[in-house]
Interface confidence: medium
Amino acid sequence: TPLGPKWPEPVFGRLASPGFPGEYANDQERRWTLTAPPGYRLRLYFTHFDLELSHLCEYDFVKLSSGAKVLATLCGQESTDTERAPGKDTFYSLGSSLDITFRSDYSNEKPFTGFEAFYAAEDIDECQVAPGEAPTCDHHCHNHLGGFYCSCRAGYVLHRNKRTCSALCSGQVFTQRSGELSSPEYPRPYPKLSSCTYSISLEEGFSVILDFVESFDVETHPETLCPYDFLKIQTDREEHGPFCGKTLPHRIETKSNTVTITFVTDESGDHTGWKIHYTSTAQPCPYPMAPPNGHVSPVQAKYILKDSFSIFCETGYELLQGHLPLKSFTAVCQKDGSWDRPMPACSIVDCGPPDDLPSGRVEYITGPGVTTYKAVIQYSCEETFYTMKVNDGKYVCEADGFWTSSKGEKSLPVCEPVCGLSARTTGGRIYGGQKAKPGDFPWQVLILGGTTAAGALLYDNWVLTAAHAVYEQKHDASALDIRMGTLKRLSPHYTQAWSEAVFIHEGYTHDAGFDNDIALIKLNNKVVINSNITPICLPRKEAESFMRTDDIGTASGWGLTQRGFLARNLMYVDIPIVDHQKCTAAYEKPPYPRGSVTANMLCAGLESGGKDSCRGDSGGALVFLDSETERWFVGGIVSWGSMNCGEAGQYGVYTKVINYIPWIENIISDF
């Protein structure tokens, strides 16, 4: 008869032999069935026990059973070799039910008082198992009142049997050319009740090779082929396996770019599994041979699908595909064993024919017409009238395809006209205007454009003149008629030049004195330099040492002569420099405004008069001989003077050119 309250009320109580604490009667049989809720067990212990002792408890006994299993058969008061009394032992049901049977036989030799026992239901800790028994759960076991549940580590899922953890081992796709894969947990035992699928998927053209490495241990059977756990390898062509046992399978050359590996395990066994190292191969491409003067990178034993190489040319050689230059070259091996691009050539860099040098020439040094890498050419300027500017003229064809000077310049050298050459041998005479002879003043420029003026040639495309002489034409430079290379003002034989632009000094104010009376005319073409057309030199820093008081300068021009007419033939006069204070004082008195002579001016002439420049000479150069370089340079520009040219006590006033060197250089370099 069931005892104890209905669930969920607590299950506990007391049992005792009939008549306890008095003696029990003969021929008694009593049975108690105790039932606990599922997930609980029953605990029973005795507080009193006194039964007749008999061999193997055959006469009187208390039997404890749980299900089909007898937990104990008890009799006597104390345990002997063959009989057991409960003593202080506690007894536990195996499940949630416990049967207690009390029996006494037909006689007792003396009175026995029987037994008293107490019971209670208690939670079973299913997570605790005896040593050597299988664990309740594969991974994690969680006990709770009335039961337990299992859970799994990351990467596993609980099987529908609620105890086994199946590996989440499907869907892995390997796309690298080589790699490793193994059974879950390898080299520890693989999980039970799992179905793993691994895919190797390479680009078409590759062939996967599988090597089983280290160890192989998959549950097997002596008679049946892999009935429990097995490994299968599937390609689009064939299936390999199933594999099991302890022997490493042989290498598998799949001849396929896609492989599916299936691993299935059952609910039992303890095996370490497998490990596969996979590689791939493909049809190699023809071995690349570097073109002459080039090299292949990287160098490999062979080149298969997707492998590539680049070609790099030696210095001085360039990549060419046919006739087309390439910045770089890389070829890729294709699945059919061919390269995607034909091999280029490394062709020697050719700088091409060197550019012609204005007023100069070029000579092939390496060999006639040789213009390839490391070839040398020599530029030189036309002798006498031109000189090479800051360059030795030697150019080498460099790897970048440019002719390059020893200083690394890629631009042409410049043939600058030689300045300050004159056929005149200076004399000491300082009186009387003289007729110029051919080559005496080859820098002399005649400027026609409303009035007659003069200028001096600088380099081969600039004219230095006075601002007041070209002021009216500053916005119409093309109106200036510029002539050179002639002595006769009216001669039809001259070299014509035209103006591209007129630059008047920003400090010059027209009709308000002659300070900063300086201008530059840029010619629209370079003039050819010869003995009759040669530029004047600009003064060196040291030039003032040749322009002290009483030093002789020479003015030239077609200006008014003593007869009051413009000169037909170019005239010149040698005149001394006048002390600046003396000159300033000469122009301090009326009709000249105070401050007419500035520090930007120099004066030249005779105190007694008679030697001077005059109207029509404006803009012309007052030149001096640099005795160190033996070249003539421009010290002054004919600017202004007394109303009456050559007047005693008055002097010709010239723009002091040395003060304007930075201005001149800036304009010429900017334009």
Partner: antibody
Framework: EVQLVESGGGLVQPGGSLRLSCAAS????????MAWVRQAPGKGLEWVAT????????YYRDSVKGRFTISRDNAKNSLYLQMNSLRAEDTAVYYC??????????????????WGQGTLVTVSS | EIVLTQSPATLSLSPGERATLSCRAS??????IHWYQQKPGQAPRLLIK???RSISGIPARFSGSGSGTDFTLTISSLEPEDFAVYYC?????????FGQGTKLEIK
């Protein structure tokens, strides 16, 4: 005069092995890539394998990869073809051939300029 | 792999006639096509290399042309000894392949 003489052919069971040899004379052997080309009875020509002049690289047709090995001994002017795991479809006359060392468009690629008389390999049970 | 297709499979002509044999590649092979002649019981013999380059010792009546995918072997005037099987071969890919052959027979 260029001469290539093959030997080592014969009857072999499926799965069996055979080693073919080719003795070369009359040219500078170590200047040439060498190849084996086969011809099944009544069928066309089929390239089998190539080895570069210095032995540094080998090339095989897919169906023989892993089963056949081409090698050479430049000191002995000899070319070899080791054939394992033979199949019925490997039955053919095997020709030893020089593969020209010329390279076109910058890659080693060859034509077969000199040929031996061939040796017959029969794979049958 | 690169597939070479030769046409016609058989060509019947008489001595003195002009023979034109065709070889078509499944993809461009530049000029990396070579032609061979094979007579019964003999090894093949190289006739033309790299589509059109002649081989010393080969009669001038043999010539080749083409590039890319279409190639032709021409025998200008057939001699009795020219009746044989002719093969083309590509070396553009390292996986060398031959055509299936054209049999040139006496008409």
């Amino acid at each position: 005069e260029v001469q290539l003489v093959e030997s080592g052919g014969g009857l072999v069971q499926p799965g069996g092995s055979l080693r073919l040899s080719c003795a070369a004379s009359g040219f500078t052997f170590n200047d040439y890539n060498m190849a084996w080309v086969r011809q099944a009875p009544g069928k066309g020509l089929e390239w089998v394998a190539t080895i570069l002049f210095d032995g540094s690289r080998t090339y095989y047709r897919d169906s023989v990869k892993g089963r056949f090995t081409i090698s050479r001994d430049n000191a002995k002017n000899s070319l070899y073809l080791q054939m394992n795991s033979l199949r019925a479809e490997d039955t053919a006359v095997y020709y030893c051939s020089t593969e020209s060392p010329y390279y076109s468009e910058g890659y080693y690629q060859g034509y077969f300029d000199y040929w031996g008389q061939g040796t017959l390999v029969t794979v049958s049970s | 792999e690169i597939v070479l297709t030769q046409s016609p499979a058989t060509l019947s002509l008489s001595p003195g006639e002009r023979a034109t044999l065709s070889c078509r590649a499944s993809q461009s092979v530049s000029t990396s096509i070579h032609w061979y002649q094979q007579k019964p019981g003999q090894a093949p013999r190289l006739l033309i290399k790299y589509a059109s380059r002649s081989i010393s010792g080969i009669p001038a009546r043999f010539s080749g042309s083409g590039s890319g995918t279409d190639f032709t072997l021409t025998i200008s005037s057939l001699e009795p000894e020219d009746f044989a099987v002719y093969y083309c071969q590509q070396s553009y890919s390292s996986l060398y392949t031959f055509g299936q052959g054209t049999k040139l027979e006496i008409k």
